[in-house]
């Protein structure tokens, strides 16, 4: 029931789960100079019964006694923005979110935890995308992805989102409704949704990847 891959990578976007399905694992990772305590948990696990879900195990980090010989690369702040955002989650929980049956909330931070959280999601998990600061969201539909089981194999659905740099926004008039612009669909069927972002997406389902083709550039 664990999802084989990470959620899709959308350039210039990060994703977040608002709640974590039971069975989700969170690696107990420590920041540089710290390590898991001996006999400490490798991961936290979202478990529960019919009425309540919570994280089993506790992550604990202690100061590294010996120098770590494995090379670690800490990205610079600018690099971090553009890094693959899969599994990178903010420990902030939106205050307005109602709790969901069979789901855990965002685990609170533990002392000296790593800057990135690595989750292992299960089938049925939904994650939501947002463009990073400085990028504008162009939507064909919801900016979400669900891990689903198809023919015994897990896959994530494709978020209907593109994040474009502010300097490119003139290509996508948000104020005017364009004449019905053709648009692709994630399941490669015809669409009749009209969007004010005036762009076209073609979907290569064979690779379950989306290629963005902007009408202003290529037509």
């Amino acid at each position: 029931e664990l999802c084989d891959d990470d959620p899709p990578e959308i350039p210039h976007a990060t994703f977040k789960a608002m709640a974590y399905k039971e069975g989700t694992m969170l690696n107990c990772e420590c920041k540089r100079g710290f390590r898991r305590i001996k006999s400490g948990s490798l991961y936290m696990l979202c478990t529960g019964n019919s009425s309540h879900s919570s994280w089993d195990n506790q992550c604990q980090c202690t100061s590294s006694a010996t120098r770590n010989t494995t090379k670690q690369v800490t990205p610079q702040p600018e690099e971090q923005k553009e890094r693959k955002t899969t599994e990178m989650q903010s420990p902030m929980q939106p205050v307005d979110q109602a709790s969901l049956p069979g789901h855990c909330r965002e685990p609170p931070p533990w002392e000296n935890e790593a800057t990135e959280r690595i989750y292992h999601f299960v089938v049925g998990q939904m994650v939501y995308y947002q463009c990073v600061q400085g990028y504008r969201a162009l939507h064909r539909g919801p900016a979400e992805s669900v891990c689903k089981m198809t023919h015994g194999k897990t896959r994530w659905t494709q978020p209907q989102l593109i994040c474009t740099g502010e300097m490119e926004t003139s290509q996508f008039p948000g104020e005017e409704k364009p004449q019905a612009s053709p648009e692709g669909r994630p399941e490669s069927e015809t669409s009749c949704l009209v969007t004010t972002t005036d762009f076209q997406i073609q979907t290569e389902m064979a690779a379950t990847m989306e290629t963005s083709i902007f009408t202003t550039e290529y037509q």
Epitope: Y128, H139, G174, C192
Partner: antibody, heavy 119, light 106 residues
Framework: QVQLVESGGGVVQPGGSLRLSCAVS????????IQWVRQAPGKGLEWVSV???????NYNSALMSRFTISKDNSKSTLYLQMNSLRAEDTAVYYC?????????????WGQGTLVTVSS | DIQMTQSPSSLSASVGDRVTITCRAS?????MHWYQQKPGKAPKPLIF???NLASGVPSRFSGSGSGTDYTLTISSLQPEDFATYYC?????????FGGGTKLEIK
């Protein structure tokens, strides 16, 4: 506490205009998309439009030439401007918010506002 | 547009019955959401992404399905479950709802 409250409904003549409002609280319109869904008397639900957190919009193609969705983030208010109204636009109009950011699953709904188009 | 066909359109059942409502999409969709609506009230979220329960929804409700066929099951009907149920997809544009299934007391 997430809340959405619609207003602006009423009786309007065919060909007339109406602007619906949806005042939200407990969250920011800069983080979540809001959708309009309508329901004609005794009928099912019909999706109308969405304005996403970043401001981009999608419409039901059958309605887009007459309806315009907009928002004022600072006032935490969403609007639906409806022009050239027809009898078939008579419905309860709901604004609704997804559970997560710009998601599809509508976890929070307003109480609805009734629009009656009649001469 | 993807058409969502719910069956049955209406259903009479008794408290304690097991009830299944089906939603068939005209083309394959990735997942389905379900809502419950009572007369004069706004729809209430029930199930999201095919099988996840919404907040406050009792465990007697469950959802399943894939491709074009999805089901909502109520394992043991309670008096408060008599209402109209709608499915919704947004795997493809535009988002569409099923026509509804009205669940009435026998």
């Amino acid at each position: 506490q997430v809340q959405l409250v619609e207003s602006g409904g009423g009786v309007v003549q065919p060909g007339g205009s109406l602007r619906l409002s949806c005042a939200v609280s407990g969250f920011s319109l800069t983080s979540y998309g809001i959708q309009w869904v309508r329901q004609a008397p005794g009928k099912g639900l019909e999706w109308v439009s969405v304005i996403w957190a970043g401001g981009s919009t999608n419409y039901n193609s059958a309605l887009m030439s007459r309806f315009t969705i907009s928002k004022d983030n600072s006032k935490s208010t969403l609007y639906l401007q409806m022009n050239s109204l027809r009898a078939e636009d008579t419905a309860v109009y709901y604004c609704a918010r997804a559970y997560g950011y710009d998601g599809s699953w509508l976890a929070y709904w307003g109480q609805g506002t009734l629009v009656t188009v009649s001469s | 547009d993807i058409q969502m066909t719910q069956s049955p359109s209406s259903l009479s059942a008794s408290v304690g019955d097991r009830v299944t409502i089906t939603c068939r999409a005209s083309s394959s969709v990735s997942y389905m959401h379900w809502y419950q609506q009572k007369p004069g009230k706004a729809p209430k979220p029930l199930i999201f992404a095919t099988s996840n329960l919404a907040s406050g929804v009792p465990s007697r409700f469950s959802g399943s399905g894939s491709g074009t066929d999805y089901t909502l099951t109520i394992s043991s009907l309670q008096p408060e479950d008599f209402a109209t149920y709608y499915c919704q997809q947004w795997s493809s544009n535009p988002p569409t709802f099923g026509g509804g299934t009205k669940l009435e007391i026998k």
